[in-house]
């Protein structure tokens, strides 16, 4: 019964790590306009991994995408790469556990496979929610260098007249959803190796065991009986204890919508 | 077409406050920021503030944080600015004009509601 | 606050002629995010409020006529009315729309020769 709980919530915290993972991906705030210096400005900025958008005071938000692939900076490919390789591995990894999931029967499937398949989907979940962190981190240490040499240079002036505040940029909403998404997947994914080890079949054989009935001292051989323990190769016909009382897990992957104003 | 109606000239004494509406038709009220703006005689524009219909959200010029105040009432489509404590320098003509949504300039304006504050 | 600077404070000109007047502001109105001036030109005529002409400091508001242009970048803007027409004798007003709290320059008024 544990594994079944251990195996269904690490696959939900994963579905739910893979929708932020998802999310934070799409979202247009990776970093937002560094507001400390000047509080008062009426246009507000914020760039996301696909597109750029301004947000006027009036309402109006203007988004332009980023129309080019060899103009982009290194990193911010880096980071794109990561963060699909991370939606891809969940993905399938999810995938894999809908059918790995003890609560749920499919055909002839032995607990054996079933143990193998939660190993496969915890590890990919592993895998996602590291990419997904590295993407991020990677994207916050390249906002955190640019902030500061930004900072260095902040005005530059004509006699000391005018002066130009340069935009600088800080951690926007997307990098703690993906953080936060991260390591939701990191640790379904975790619980499901877990589940996994309680899931892999135990070859327990009782040794002699002697019945002393009335009159007759019948002694069964060794090997001659296997421990019905559900996990057996035999258990194929001799069910004895079906952990999934049929309880359909309904898991919905509620999209995430952004309201591009 | 859009319309912005203000209320008819006041003259007020120093210290009293005075309350200008702005009735708005033609378009979503609620939809648009509403800029107060004022020009003394013979001066030139003033910024004074701005508020949202839908949130009621405001932004004041600090030079009139303490002395203003801006409401509406969305189920007359008006907009109201009250400015207290008046002084003989807030003599001056008083526009409400219209948040222009493909950019930050308000594009439709009021006629002007002059006050005057004497003693 | 963002000071805006006016120039010349008064213009003679007649009709037919190319007008340009200037605006200056304490500090860049240039949006790094979407590579925009925010910087607005309206009309006033005497007793009338205030007309908007253009807004990102070079487009023009619909139904305003050709003849008005802007144009500049960062600190110093420039509004020309390239053939002056009766109509068009006014005060105009440049205005920092960046940053909080808006601010008007003192304005140009604009007057028959």
């Known amino acids: 019964m544990a594994v079944t709980a251990c195996q269904g919530l690490g696959f939900v915290v994963s579905l739910i790590g893979i929708a932020g993972i998802i999310a934070a991906t799409c979202m247009d705030q990776w970093s937002t306009q560094d507001l400390y210096n000047n509080p008062v400005t009426a246009v507000f900025n914020y760039q996301g991994l696909w597109r750029s958008c301004v947000r006027e005071s009036s309402g109006f938000t203007e988004c332009r995408g980023y129309f080019t692939l060899l103009g982009l900076p290194a990193m911010l490919q880096a980071v794109r790469a990561l963060m699909i390789v991370g939606i891809v591995l969940g993905a399938i990894g999810l995938l894999v556990s809908i059918f790995a999931l003890k609560c749920i029967r499919i055909g002839s499937m032995e607990d054996s496979a079933k143990a193998n398949m939660t190993l496969t989907s915890g590890i990919m979940f592993i895998v996602s929610g590291l990419c997904a962190i590295a993407g991020v981190s990677v994207f916050a240490n390249m906002l955190v260098t640019n902030f500061w040499m930004s900072t260095a240079n902040m005005y530059t002036g004509m006699g000391g007249m005018v002066q130009t505040v340069q935009t600088r940029y800080t951690f926007g909403a997307a990098l703690f959803v993906g953080w936060v998404a991260g390591g939701l997947t990191l640790i379904g994914g975790v619980m499901m190796c877990i589940a996994c080890r309680g899931l892999a079949p135990e070859e327990t054989n009782y040794k002699a065991v002697s019945y002393h009935a009335s009159g007759h001292s019948v002694a069964y051989k060794p090997g001659g009986f296997k421990a019905s323990t559900g996990f057996g190769s035999n258990t194929k016909n001799k069910k004895i204890y079906d952990g999934g009382a049929r309880t359909e897990d309904e898991v919905q992957s509620y999209p995430s919508k952004h309201d591009y104003v | 077409q859009v319309q912005l109606v203000q209320s008819g000239a006041e003259v007020k004494k120093p210290g009293a406050s005075v309350k200008v509406s702005c009735k708005a038709s033609?378009?979503?009220?609620?939809?648009?920021?509403m800029h107060w703006v004022r020009q003394a005689p013979g001066q030139g524009l003033e910024w004074i503030g701005m508020?949202?219909?839908?949130?009621?959200?405001?932004n004041y010029n600090e030079k009139f944080k303490s002395r203003v105040t801006m409401t509406v009432d969305t189920s007359t489509s008006t907009a109201y600015m009250e400015l207290s404590s008046l002084r003989s320098e807030d003599t001056a003509v008083y526009y409400c004009?219209?948040?222009?949504?493909?950019?930050?300039?308000?594009?439709?304006w009021g006629q002007g509601t002059t006050v005057t504050v004497s003693s | 606050d963002i000071q805006m600077t006016q120039s010349p404070s008064s213009l003679s000109a007649s009709v037919g002629d190319r007008v340009t007047m200037t605006c200056k502001s304490s500090?860049?109105?240039?949006?790094?995010?979407?590579?925009?001036?925010?910087l607005t030109w309206y009309q006033q005529k005497p007793g009338k409020a205030p007309k908007l002409l253009i807004y990102?400091?070079?487009t023009r508001e619909s139904g305003v006529p050709s003849r008005f242009s802007g144009s500049g970048s960062g600190t110093d803007f420039t509004l020309t009315i390239s053939s002056l027409q009766p109509e068009d004798f006014a005060t105009y007003y440049c205005?920092?729309?960046?940053?909080?709290?808006?601010?008007f320059g003192g304005g140009t008024k604009l007057e028959i020769k």
């Open positions: 004009a219209r948040r222009y949504y493909g950019s930050i300039s308000p594009d439709y």
């Open positions: 033609g378009y979503t009220f609620t939809s648009y920021w």
């Open positions: 508020i949202h219909p839908n949130s009621g959200s405001t």
């Open positions: 500090q860049s109105l240039l949006n790094s995010g979407n590579q925009k001036n925010y």
């Open positions: 990102w400091a070079s």
């Open positions: 205005q920092n729309d960046y940053s909080y709290p808006f601010t």
